[in-house]
Interface confidence: low
């Protein structure tokens, strides 16, 4: 999906109203320093699609942040704000529904979410300070 | 009405050195970059480097790295741009222009620095 | 560095005409792409950003696509205020860098 046509004021007041916050309470009890950001983003469609891509694409060690409130708010956010967006998404649901149906909270999962922040935050303050 | 208002035209001599300011009204400071691009006479635009208002982190091109200073004034909104060891070379116009994404939505009018002996 | 090559670098036409002027990355660039429009005195102006979406207050006659590595501005419609010179350039990371220009002049 090319991001680059979403409402970037839109999402980013989405963020800061709802989502920011179901990512602090999901990473509680987490120190902010136990996991170094390794993922990077240039501009704010480029952060979408590393965001969508963290967010909802399964991987090894943590299979069920899909679930989760701010994966769900991310998802309407950008349904609403991205046009075309919700088309792109039927297979992507389909995973979903297959993922694990109880919430596992894994150490793989807490540092995905750790990385998840640092693309919002990046989000909102776009552009590499290096290539 | 998102302004950016840049300093008056310089004259000054090989070796010596030049601030040009760039002052921002009409947004929040703090939310965009500031990036400076300079024109030779007759020439295209080249893209000298970035400074982060809100930290006042800056990126610069290889060339001018030993060169050039960029700094902020965040209680007067004003980003400055200080070039050193001035050559016949760096005649150009200088401009400032704010960005989110990369791409310059506002810039200033423009600072002629002529460096001539 | 990514090096941005524009062509033409000058070109003669009438008003009414189709202008296409084209930017070629040398690397992908996505549509981290934005074009510029800067007359004689005067700093540059957007036009276009993200390879394709209108800057506020541009005309519709400006366009801007995209295939793979190669960018166009086309202008559908010559009119006298777009004699000018227009610049392509990536925004996709550091160094930002920009194409050499096109001059657009009066045929």
């Known amino acids: 999906y090319d991001f680059t046509n979403c409402d970037f004021e839109k999402i980013k007041a989405a963020y800061l109203s709802t989502i920011s916050k179901d990512l602090i309470t999901y990473m509680s009890g987490t120190k902010s320093t136990e996991f170094n950001n390794t993922v990077s983003c240039s501009n704010r469609p480029h952060c979408l699609t590393e965001i969508q891509s963290l967010t909802f694409n399964p991987t090894a060690g943590c299979a069920s942040l899909a679930k989760e409130m701010f994966a769900m708010k991310t998802k309407a956010a950008l349904a609403i704000w991205c046009p075309g967006y919700s088309e792109t998404q039927i297979n992507a649901t389909q995973a979903m529904k297959k993922a694990r149906k109880s919430k596992v909270t894994t150490n793989k999962c807490l540092e995905q979410v750790s990385q998840l922040q640092g693309l919002w935050r990046r989000f909102n303050r776009p552009l590499l300070k290096q290539q | 009405e998102v302004q950016l208002v840049q300093s008056g035209a310089e004259v000054k001599k090989p070796g010596a050195s030049v601030k040009v300011s760039c002052k921002a009204s009409?947004?929040?400071?703090?939310?965009?970059?500031m990036h400076w691009v300079r024109q030779a006479p007759g020439q295209g635009l080249e893209w000298m480097g970035m400074i982060d208002p809100s930290d006042s982190e800056t990126t610069l091109i290889q060339k001018f790295k030993d060169r050039v200073t960029m700094t902020v004034d965040k209680s007067t909104s004003t980003a400055y741009m200080e070039l050193s060891s001035l050559r016949s070379e760096d005649t150009a116009v200088y401009y400032c222009a704010r960005t989110l994404d990369g791409y310059y939505d506002y810039w200033g009018q423009g600072t002629t620095v002529t460096v001539s002996s | 560095d990514i090096q941005m090559t524009q062509s033409p670098s000058s070109l003669s036409a009438s008003v009414g005409d189709r202008v296409t002027i084209t930017c070629r990355a040398s690397e992908n660039i996505y549509s981290y792409l934005a074009w510029y429009q800067q007359k004689p005195g005067k700093a540059p102006k957007l036009l276009v950003y993200f390879a394709k979406t209108l800057a506020e207050g541009v005309p519709s006659r400006f366009s801007g696509s995209v295939s793979g590595t190669d960018f166009t501005l086309t202008i559908s419609s010559l009119q006298p205020e777009d004699f000018a010179t227009y610049y392509c350039q990536h925004h996709y990371g550091t160094p930002w860098t920009f194409g050499g220009g096109t001059k657009v002049e009066i045929k």
């Open positions: 009409g947004y929040t400071f703090t939310t965009y970059w």
